[in-house]
Amino acid sequence: KEEQTTFRDCAEIFKSGLTTSGIYTLTFPNSTEEIKAYCDMDVGGGGWTVIQHREDGSVDFQRTWKEYKEGFGSPLGEYWLGNEFVSQLTGQHRYVLKIQLKDWEGNEAHSLYDHFYLAGEESNYRIHLTGLTGTAGKISSISQPGSDFSTKDSDNDKCICKCSQMLSGGWWFDACGPSNLNGQYYPQKQNTNKFNGIKWYYWKGSGYSLKATTMMIRPADF
């Protein structure tokens, strides 16, 4: 049997026998275009493609539409994988989304959605989510039904304000909504009473900016 040389996600890599967490090269569906991603092969059985990570404020997340489309940062540290790749990938098969959160007091929580996909760019990468479980709130901190993605130069929210400019970062803003994991990074002791921080309302409430976040996806049938 021929060894598989291209992989569409980290689940395929895991199933091929490569089970060490790290940076791997993925290929866009139906294309030869490649992208580097961090694969988490340890959490909950492994095979997770990390699509977002925050940990120290080393990367500026107040980026343009093009940058959020194509991805930015370093897969070894803080990064955004890219809306176009995620949209194409999640449009092909059913994926689950796991969001892992850390606060400044040493607590961890997660939200798991049993179906996640992004619409195409023509629909502003609108987010679709169903089936929430987990410890980071019984109500979804990503507004339901899903919103369009907005950035500082592409305002697609439901607000008379520009949420991305007001709150910082590209996100699926409502008006503006209960979350923003791409907000301004605030260090410990400066992370409360912040309107534009890294917010997951139904876990930590208003004004609390989180220490670390990871968004990762995996096929539902993994």
């Epitope: 901190s141 439901k158 607000c159 008379i160 304000c161 949420c163 007001m166 008006a175 503006c176 909504g177 209960p178 009473n193 912040k194 309107f195 309302y201 139904y202 208003s206 004004g207």
Partner: nanobody, 134 residues
């Protein structure tokens, strides 16, 4: 630094009245909507009323409509919640909170409404206790 300080809470008999005050500082008052939320023991925090002094937009929870009135004094950077015909179920800690007035949908602006969704509010006071006995 943003500060919201509530006062005016206390104990009252059912049918009585109280006036809560929220003194705001650290931001341009006219640019913000001020909300009142409450939390009773063992219950979720709920929106009571809000006001945007720049355009007079207000909103009330169904449970307090016709009994509570919100108003603002821009000169004093203070918002008031006049509570009449109080009921035992109004017993709670009442919080004052603030959100930029522009953080609204066009539909809300057309309807002259402000947010009663607590997740939109960024800044919170420490709260004042209201106890209504029968």
């Amino acid at each position: 630094e943003v500060q919201l300080v509530e006062s005016g809470g206390g104990s009252v008999q059912a049918g009585g009245s109280l006036r809560l005050s929220c003194a705001a500082s650290g931001f341009t008052f006219d640019d913000y909507a001020i909300g009142w939320f409450r939390q009773a023991p063992g219950k979720e925090r709920e929106g009571v009323s809000c006001i945007s002094s720049s355009d007079g937009s207000t909103n009330y929870a169904d449970s307090v409509k016709g009994r509570f009135t919100i108003s603002s004094d821009t000169a004093k950077n203070t918002v008031y919640l006049q509570m009449n015909s109080l009921k035992p179920e109004d017993t709670a800690v009442y919080y004052c909170t603030a959100v930029p007035a522009t953080r609204r949908t066009p539909q809300m602006v057309d309807a002259n409404m402000c947010w009663l969704a607590e997740y939109e509010y960024d800044y919170w006071g420490q709260g004042t206790q209201v106890t209504v006995s029968s």
